[in-house]
Protein backbone atom coordinates (compact mmCIF):
# COMPACT_ATOMS: atom_id res chain seq x y z
CA UNK A 1 0.00 0.00 0.00
CA UNK A 2 1.44 3.35 -1.07
CA UNK A 3 0.44 6.98 -1.28
CA UNK A 4 0.08 8.06 -4.89
CA UNK A 5 -0.75 11.74 -4.28
CA UNK A 6 0.49 13.16 -0.99
CA UNK A 7 -1.98 14.78 1.39
CA UNK A 8 -2.82 18.43 0.75
CA UNK A 9 -4.70 20.33 3.43
CA UNK A 10 -6.73 23.50 3.77
CA UNK A 11 -7.91 25.17 6.96
CA UNK A 12 -11.07 27.11 7.68
CA UNK A 13 -8.96 29.08 10.19
CA UNK A 14 -11.35 28.20 12.93
CA UNK A 15 -11.84 24.59 13.92
CA UNK A 16 -11.48 22.28 10.92
CA UNK A 17 -8.77 21.49 8.42
CA UNK A 18 -9.47 19.15 5.53
CA UNK A 19 -6.77 16.92 4.06
CA UNK A 20 -7.14 14.93 0.84
CA UNK A 21 -4.86 12.35 -0.77
CA UNK A 22 -4.88 9.45 -3.19
CA UNK A 23 -3.68 5.91 -2.67
CA UNK A 24 -2.15 3.71 -5.38
CA UNK A 25 -5.25 1.56 -5.58
CA UNK A 26 -8.76 1.09 -4.21
CA UNK A 27 -8.65 1.58 -0.44
CA UNK A 28 -11.13 1.37 2.38
CA UNK A 29 -9.85 4.56 3.97
CA UNK A 30 -11.74 4.32 7.25
CA UNK A 31 -10.64 0.77 8.08
CA UNK A 32 -7.13 0.73 6.64
CA UNK A 33 -5.73 4.19 7.37
CA UNK A 34 -5.24 6.63 10.24
CA UNK A 35 -3.96 10.20 10.08
CA UNK A 36 -2.24 11.31 13.29
CA UNK A 37 -1.75 15.03 13.81
CA UNK A 38 -0.76 17.55 16.44
CA UNK A 39 0.86 20.94 16.80
CA UNK A 40 4.53 20.22 16.25
CA UNK A 41 5.64 22.16 19.35
CA UNK A 42 2.86 21.08 21.69
CA UNK A 43 3.45 18.86 24.68
CA UNK A 44 0.44 16.68 23.99
CA UNK A 45 -0.83 13.40 22.63
CA UNK A 46 -1.57 13.16 18.93
CA UNK A 47 -5.09 13.43 17.61
CA UNK A 48 -6.33 10.66 15.33
CA UNK A 49 -8.41 11.35 12.24
CA UNK A 50 -10.33 8.48 10.65
CA UNK A 51 -10.43 9.18 6.91
CA UNK A 52 -13.42 8.74 4.63
CA UNK A 53 -13.41 7.55 1.05
CA UNK A 54 -13.40 10.21 -1.64
CA UNK A 55 -13.62 8.16 -4.83
CA UNK A 56 -12.08 4.71 -5.30
CA UNK A 57 -8.48 5.49 -4.30
CA UNK A 58 -9.09 8.91 -2.72
CA UNK A 59 -9.29 9.64 0.99
CA UNK A 60 -10.35 12.73 2.92
CA UNK A 61 -9.89 13.56 6.60
CA UNK A 62 -11.47 16.35 8.61
CA UNK A 63 -9.01 17.41 11.32
CA UNK A 64 -10.51 19.03 14.39
CA UNK A 65 -8.37 21.86 15.73
CA UNK A 66 -8.40 24.46 18.45
CA UNK A 67 -8.82 28.05 17.39
CA UNK A 68 -5.98 28.61 14.94
CA UNK A 69 -3.24 31.23 15.31
CA UNK A 70 -0.58 32.19 12.77
CA UNK A 71 2.22 30.43 14.67
CA UNK A 72 0.51 27.05 14.41
CA UNK A 73 2.32 24.30 12.54
CA UNK A 74 1.03 20.73 12.54
CA UNK A 75 2.88 17.47 12.10
CA UNK A 76 0.95 14.83 10.15
CA UNK A 77 1.69 11.08 10.10
CA UNK A 78 -0.32 8.77 7.84
CA UNK A 79 -0.39 5.16 9.06
CA UNK A 80 -1.65 1.89 7.60
CA UNK A 81 -1.63 -0.35 10.65
CA UNK A 82 1.98 -0.35 11.88
CA UNK A 83 3.34 0.98 8.58
CA UNK A 84 4.13 4.68 8.30
CA UNK A 85 3.12 5.67 4.77
CA UNK A 86 3.80 9.40 4.82
CA UNK A 87 5.04 12.12 7.14
CA UNK A 88 4.49 15.80 6.55
CA UNK A 89 3.61 19.16 8.04
CA UNK A 90 0.89 21.74 7.57
CA UNK A 91 0.71 25.39 8.55
CA UNK A 92 -2.99 26.34 8.60
CA UNK A 93 -2.38 30.08 8.17
CA UNK A 94 -0.66 29.43 4.84
CA UNK A 95 -3.47 27.28 3.41
CA UNK A 96 -6.76 28.95 4.29
CA UNK A 97 -10.07 28.28 2.62
CA UNK A 98 -12.71 30.36 4.43
CA UNK A 99 -16.03 28.97 5.49
CA UNK A 100 -18.91 29.71 3.15
CA UNK A 101 -21.20 32.59 4.10
CA UNK A 102 -24.69 31.60 5.20
CA UNK A 103 -28.25 32.84 5.50
CA UNK A 104 -28.31 34.56 2.13
CA UNK A 105 -31.55 36.54 1.89
CA UNK A 106 -32.94 38.71 -0.87
CA UNK A 107 -35.11 41.58 0.36
CA UNK A 108 -37.42 42.71 -2.42
CA UNK A 109 -39.65 45.02 -0.44
CA UNK A 110 -37.39 48.05 -0.84
CA UNK A 111 -38.71 50.18 -3.66
CA UNK A 112 -37.01 49.26 -6.94
CA UNK A 113 -33.93 48.09 -5.01
CA UNK A 114 -32.76 44.59 -4.25
CA UNK A 115 -31.01 44.18 -0.90
CA UNK A 116 -29.02 40.98 -0.51
CA UNK A 117 -27.75 40.15 2.96
CA UNK A 118 -25.83 37.19 4.34
CA UNK A 119 -24.04 36.18 7.48
CA UNK A 120 -20.31 36.33 8.11
CA UNK A 121 -19.32 32.69 8.76
CA UNK A 122 -16.89 33.62 11.57
CA UNK A 123 -17.47 34.74 15.15
CA UNK A 124 -16.28 38.27 16.01
CA UNK A 125 -13.25 36.99 17.95
CA UNK A 126 -11.85 35.18 14.90
CA UNK A 127 -9.19 37.06 12.93
CA UNK A 128 -10.95 36.50 9.62
CA UNK A 129 -14.19 38.10 10.83
CA UNK A 130 -12.98 41.59 9.90
CA UNK A 131 -10.98 40.54 6.84
CA UNK A 132 -13.48 38.86 4.54
CA UNK A 133 -14.59 40.24 1.22
CA UNK A 134 -17.22 38.63 -0.93
CA UNK A 135 -18.36 37.80 -4.44
CA UNK A 136 -22.07 37.61 -5.14
CA UNK A 137 -23.19 35.59 -8.15
CA UNK A 138 -26.62 36.30 -9.62
CA UNK A 139 -28.02 34.36 -12.55
CA UNK A 140 -31.25 33.84 -14.39
CA UNK A 141 -32.84 30.43 -14.28
CA UNK A 142 -34.28 31.06 -17.76
CA UNK A 143 -31.26 32.49 -19.53
CA UNK A 144 -27.83 30.90 -18.92
CA UNK A 145 -26.16 33.94 -20.49
CA UNK A 146 -27.66 36.21 -17.83
CA UNK A 147 -24.94 35.53 -15.29
CA UNK A 148 -23.16 38.22 -13.28
CA UNK A 149 -20.67 38.60 -10.42
CA UNK A 150 -20.64 41.52 -7.99
CA UNK A 151 -17.49 42.02 -5.93
CA UNK A 152 -18.19 43.24 -2.41
CA UNK A 153 -14.91 44.74 -1.22
CA UNK A 154 -16.28 46.40 1.91
CA UNK A 155 -16.75 44.51 5.18
CA UNK A 156 -20.53 44.72 5.48
CA UNK A 157 -22.15 41.45 4.34
CA UNK A 158 -24.70 43.04 2.07
CA UNK A 159 -25.19 44.18 -1.50
CA UNK A 160 -27.67 46.71 -2.90
CA UNK A 161 -28.51 46.70 -6.58
CA UNK A 162 -31.22 48.37 -8.62
CA UNK A 163 -33.91 45.87 -9.54
CA UNK A 164 -33.86 47.39 -13.01
CA UNK A 165 -30.38 46.02 -13.65
CA UNK A 166 -32.06 42.63 -13.91
CA UNK A 167 -34.87 41.61 -16.21
CA UNK A 168 -38.38 41.97 -14.86
CA UNK A 169 -40.85 39.14 -14.58
CA UNK A 170 -38.38 36.29 -14.37
CA UNK A 171 -36.79 34.23 -11.57
CA UNK A 172 -33.22 34.76 -10.43
CA UNK A 173 -30.92 32.92 -8.09
CA UNK A 174 -28.07 34.29 -6.01
CA UNK A 175 -25.20 32.80 -4.06
CA UNK A 176 -22.20 34.28 -2.26
CA UNK A 177 -18.65 33.23 -1.43
CA UNK A 178 -15.82 34.75 0.59
CA UNK A 179 -12.08 35.20 0.65
CA UNK A 180 -9.51 37.05 2.75
CA UNK A 181 -6.68 38.95 1.13
CA UNK A 182 -4.65 39.08 4.35
CA UNK A 183 -3.92 35.35 4.21
CA UNK A 184 -4.09 35.10 0.41
CA UNK A 185 -6.80 32.52 0.87
CA UNK A 186 -8.59 30.53 -1.78
CA UNK A 187 -12.26 31.29 -2.30
CA UNK A 188 -14.73 29.61 0.00
CA UNK A 189 -17.35 27.29 -1.39
CA UNK A 190 -20.49 29.03 -2.60
CA UNK A 191 -23.29 29.46 -0.11
CA UNK A 192 -26.54 27.67 -0.82
CA UNK A 193 -28.41 29.66 -3.44
CA UNK A 194 -31.62 31.56 -2.86
CA UNK A 195 -34.34 32.24 -5.42
CA UNK A 196 -36.64 35.19 -5.99
CA UNK A 197 -38.96 36.53 -8.66
CA UNK A 198 -37.72 39.84 -9.98
CA UNK A 199 -40.51 42.29 -10.72
CA UNK A 200 -40.49 46.05 -10.78
CA UNK A 201 -42.37 48.82 -12.57
CA UNK A 202 -40.70 49.61 -15.85
CA UNK A 203 -40.58 53.37 -16.45
CA UNK A 204 -43.30 54.50 -18.91
CA UNK A 205 -41.75 55.22 -22.26
CA UNK A 206 -43.23 58.00 -24.43
CA UNK A 207 -42.91 57.71 -28.19
Amino acid sequence: MKVLQEPTCVSDYMSISTCEWKMNGPTNCSTELRLLYQLVFLLSEAHTCIPENNGGAGCVCHLLMDDVVSADNYTLDLWAGQQLLWKGSFKPSEHVKPRAPGNLTVHTNVSDTLLLTWSNPYPPDNYLYNHLTYAVNIWSENDPADFRIYNVTYLEPSLRIAASTLKSGISYRARVRAWAQCYNTTWSEWSPSTKWHNSYREPFEQH
Partner: antibody, heavy 116, light 110 residues
Protein backbone atom coordinates in the same frame (compact mmCIF):
# COMPACT_ATOMS: atom_id res chain seq x y z
CA UNK B 1 -1.25 0.44 34.48
CA UNK B 2 -0.21 3.71 32.88
CA UNK B 3 3.29 4.56 34.09
CA UNK B 4 6.81 5.72 33.29
CA UNK B 5 9.88 4.10 34.84
CA UNK B 6 13.32 5.69 34.51
CA UNK B 7 16.61 3.82 34.74
CA UNK B 8 20.27 4.29 33.93
CA UNK B 9 21.24 6.84 36.56
CA UNK B 10 24.37 6.57 38.64
CA UNK B 11 27.82 7.99 39.22
CA UNK B 12 29.72 9.34 36.23
CA UNK B 13 32.99 11.25 35.97
CA UNK B 14 33.11 14.82 34.64
CA UNK B 15 33.41 14.77 30.86
CA UNK B 16 31.76 11.39 30.70
CA UNK B 17 28.54 10.27 29.05
CA UNK B 18 25.41 8.53 30.25
CA UNK B 19 22.21 7.29 28.63
CA UNK B 20 19.01 7.30 30.65
CA UNK B 21 16.02 5.14 29.73
CA UNK B 22 12.35 5.62 30.41
CA UNK B 23 10.04 2.67 29.84
CA UNK B 24 6.41 3.57 29.12
CA UNK B 25 3.53 1.23 29.80
CA UNK B 26 -0.20 1.65 29.31
CA UNK B 27 0.19 4.11 26.44
CA UNK B 28 2.14 4.35 23.20
CA UNK B 29 5.10 6.69 22.76
CA UNK B 30 4.47 7.02 19.02
CA UNK B 31 1.19 8.82 19.66
CA UNK B 32 2.35 10.98 22.56
CA UNK B 33 4.82 13.72 23.36
CA UNK B 34 7.23 12.77 26.12
CA UNK B 35 10.01 14.78 27.66
CA UNK B 36 12.69 15.12 30.30
CA UNK B 37 12.89 17.41 33.32
CA UNK B 38 15.65 17.52 35.91
CA UNK B 39 16.03 18.76 39.46
CA UNK B 40 19.36 19.47 41.10
CA UNK B 41 19.56 18.68 44.84
CA UNK B 42 17.60 21.31 46.78
CA UNK B 43 16.78 23.23 43.58
CA UNK B 44 13.78 23.73 41.32
CA UNK B 45 12.54 21.92 38.24
CA UNK B 46 14.40 22.50 34.97
CA UNK B 47 12.97 21.70 31.55
CA UNK B 48 15.34 19.75 29.27
CA UNK B 49 13.25 19.01 26.18
CA UNK B 50 10.79 16.65 24.57
CA UNK B 51 10.08 14.49 21.54
CA UNK B 52 6.68 14.74 19.89
CA UNK B 53 4.58 11.84 18.58
CA UNK B 54 6.21 12.14 15.16
CA UNK B 55 9.79 12.06 16.47
CA UNK B 56 10.54 15.80 16.29
CA UNK B 57 12.64 17.04 19.19
CA UNK B 58 12.82 20.34 21.08
CA UNK B 59 15.41 21.35 23.66
CA UNK B 60 15.99 24.08 26.19
CA UNK B 61 18.74 26.34 24.85
CA UNK B 62 21.21 25.22 27.51
CA UNK B 63 20.68 21.53 26.60
CA UNK B 64 21.24 21.83 22.84
CA UNK B 65 24.36 20.02 21.67
CA UNK B 66 25.08 18.01 24.82
CA UNK B 67 21.75 16.29 25.37
CA UNK B 68 19.84 14.17 22.84
CA UNK B 69 16.33 12.79 23.23
CA UNK B 70 15.31 9.72 21.22
CA UNK B 71 12.95 6.79 21.47
CA UNK B 72 12.52 3.21 20.36
CA UNK B 73 8.90 2.63 19.39
CA UNK B 74 9.29 -1.15 19.34
CA UNK B 75 10.39 -1.09 23.00
CA UNK B 76 8.08 1.82 23.90
CA UNK B 77 11.10 3.41 25.54
CA UNK B 78 12.37 6.98 25.70
CA UNK B 79 16.07 7.86 26.02
CA UNK B 80 18.19 10.78 27.13
CA UNK B 81 21.78 10.72 25.93
CA UNK B 82 23.97 13.07 27.98
CA UNK B 83 27.51 13.94 26.90
CA UNK B 84 30.35 16.05 28.31
CA UNK B 85 28.80 15.86 31.75
CA UNK B 86 29.68 18.44 34.40
CA UNK B 87 29.22 18.62 38.15
CA UNK B 88 26.26 20.98 37.67
CA UNK B 89 24.43 18.23 35.77
CA UNK B 90 24.05 16.33 39.04
CA UNK B 91 20.29 16.00 39.49
CA UNK B 92 17.31 13.72 39.61
CA UNK B 93 16.13 13.21 36.03
CA UNK B 94 12.43 12.70 35.39
CA UNK B 95 10.69 11.60 32.22
CA UNK B 96 7.14 12.85 31.79
CA UNK B 97 4.26 12.56 29.34
CA UNK B 98 2.84 15.63 27.65
CA UNK B 99 -0.83 16.49 27.69
CA UNK B 100 -2.52 19.78 26.74
CA UNK B 101 0.79 21.64 26.95
CA UNK B 102 1.80 20.27 30.35
CA UNK B 103 3.25 17.11 31.90
CA UNK B 104 0.41 14.98 33.28
CA UNK B 105 2.30 11.77 34.08
CA UNK B 106 5.76 11.57 35.69
CA UNK B 107 8.23 8.81 36.39
CA UNK B 108 9.75 8.35 39.83
CA UNK B 109 13.07 9.88 38.71
CA UNK B 110 16.63 8.58 38.49
CA UNK B 111 19.61 10.20 40.19
CA UNK B 112 22.66 11.17 38.15
CA UNK B 113 25.76 12.17 40.08
CA UNK B 114 28.69 13.74 38.22
CA UNK B 115 31.79 13.60 40.37
CA UNK B 116 35.39 12.52 40.26
CA UNK C 1 15.71 32.95 27.30
CA UNK C 2 12.13 33.09 28.55
CA UNK C 3 11.87 33.56 32.31
CA UNK C 4 9.04 32.47 34.60
CA UNK C 5 9.12 34.39 37.89
CA UNK C 6 7.11 33.17 40.87
CA UNK C 7 6.29 35.14 43.96
CA UNK C 8 6.68 34.77 46.79
CA UNK C 9 9.58 32.32 46.91
CA UNK C 10 8.21 30.98 50.17
CA UNK C 11 5.28 31.67 52.46
CA UNK C 12 4.03 30.55 55.85
CA UNK C 13 0.34 29.86 56.29
CA UNK C 14 -2.11 28.06 58.56
CA UNK C 15 -4.63 25.37 57.80
CA UNK C 16 -7.79 27.03 56.47
CA UNK C 17 -5.95 30.04 55.03
CA UNK C 18 -6.49 31.28 51.51
CA UNK C 19 -3.16 31.15 49.67
CA UNK C 20 -2.27 32.92 46.43
CA UNK C 21 0.87 32.34 44.36
CA UNK C 22 1.65 34.41 41.27
CA UNK C 23 3.68 33.59 38.18
CA UNK C 24 4.90 36.19 35.71
CA UNK C 25 6.27 35.21 32.30
CA UNK C 26 8.77 37.37 30.42
CA UNK C 27 6.77 36.71 27.22
CA UNK C 28 3.12 35.85 26.66
CA UNK C 29 2.53 32.12 26.70
CA UNK C 30 1.07 30.33 23.67
CA UNK C 31 -2.56 31.32 23.07
CA UNK C 32 -2.30 33.36 26.28
CA UNK C 33 -3.28 30.35 28.39
CA UNK C 34 -0.63 27.63 28.09
CA UNK C 35 0.38 27.80 31.73
CA UNK C 36 0.47 24.83 34.12
CA UNK C 37 0.85 24.53 37.90
CA UNK C 38 2.47 21.59 39.71
CA UNK C 39 2.74 20.50 43.32
CA UNK C 40 5.84 18.69 44.57
CA UNK C 41 6.48 17.11 47.93
CA UNK C 42 9.99 16.19 49.18
CA UNK C 43 11.40 13.07 47.50
CA UNK C 44 8.45 12.77 45.15
CA UNK C 45 7.82 13.53 41.50
CA UNK C 46 5.79 16.65 40.67
CA UNK C 47 2.03 16.34 40.29
CA UNK C 48 0.00 18.31 37.74
CA UNK C 49 -2.63 20.55 39.37
CA UNK C 50 -3.77 23.00 36.69
CA UNK C 51 -3.33 23.04 32.91
CA UNK C 52 -4.09 25.75 30.38
CA UNK C 53 -4.19 28.36 33.14
CA UNK C 54 -7.52 27.42 34.69
CA UNK C 55 -8.34 23.75 34.06
CA UNK C 56 -8.23 21.42 37.02
CA UNK C 57 -6.28 18.22 36.38
CA UNK C 58 -7.96 14.89 37.03
CA UNK C 59 -8.29 14.02 40.72
CA UNK C 60 -7.23 17.45 41.99
CA UNK C 61 -9.42 18.92 44.77
CA UNK C 62 -11.59 21.89 43.82
CA UNK C 63 -9.94 24.11 46.43
CA UNK C 64 -7.18 24.60 43.84
CA UNK C 65 -7.89 27.09 41.09
CA UNK C 66 -5.91 28.91 38.44
CA UNK C 67 -6.47 32.18 36.64
CA UNK C 68 -4.69 34.67 34.43
CA UNK C 69 -3.80 35.29 30.81
CA UNK C 70 -0.84 36.35 28.70
CA UNK C 71 2.02 36.91 31.12
CA UNK C 72 0.37 37.05 34.55
CA UNK C 73 -1.08 34.02 36.30
CA UNK C 74 -2.28 33.04 39.75
CA UNK C 75 -2.68 29.79 41.66
CA UNK C 76 -5.15 29.98 44.54
CA UNK C 77 -5.75 27.48 47.32
CA UNK C 78 -9.08 28.54 48.81
CA UNK C 79 -8.68 26.76 52.15
CA UNK C 80 -5.26 25.31 52.88
CA UNK C 81 -5.25 21.69 54.06
CA UNK C 82 -2.45 19.84 55.90
CA UNK C 83 -1.57 17.86 52.77
CA UNK C 84 -1.10 21.07 50.75
CA UNK C 85 2.19 22.01 52.41
CA UNK C 86 4.58 21.52 49.50
CA UNK C 87 6.47 23.40 46.78
CA UNK C 88 4.50 24.75 43.81
CA UNK C 89 5.85 25.41 40.31
CA UNK C 90 4.41 27.17 37.30
CA UNK C 91 5.38 26.20 33.75
CA UNK C 92 4.78 28.17 30.57
CA UNK C 93 4.29 26.73 27.10
CA UNK C 94 5.57 28.41 23.92
CA UNK C 95 5.37 27.83 20.17
CA UNK C 96 9.18 27.67 20.16
CA UNK C 97 8.88 24.32 21.95
CA UNK C 98 10.12 25.86 25.19
CA UNK C 99 8.41 24.91 28.47
CA UNK C 100 10.30 26.74 31.24
CA UNK C 101 9.46 26.39 34.92
CA UNK C 102 9.28 29.05 37.59
CA UNK C 103 11.75 28.81 40.46
CA UNK C 104 9.13 27.46 42.85
CA UNK C 105 7.15 28.65 45.87
CA UNK C 106 7.49 26.74 49.13
CA UNK C 107 4.34 26.73 51.27
CA UNK C 108 5.25 26.07 54.90
CA UNK C 109 3.27 25.68 58.13
CA UNK C 110 3.08 28.87 60.19
Amino acid sequence: EVQLVESGGGLVQPGGSLRLSCAASGFSLNSNAVGWVRQAPGKGLEYIGFINFSGITYYANWAKGRFTISRDNSKNTLYLQMNSLRAEDTAVYYCARGSAGSFDLWGQGTLVTVSS
Amino acid sequence: DIQMTQSPSSLSASVGDRVTITCQASESVYKNNYLAWYQQKPGKAPKLLIYRASNLASGVPSRFSGSGSGTDFTLTISSLQPEDFATYYCQGGYSSGMYPFGQGTKVEIK
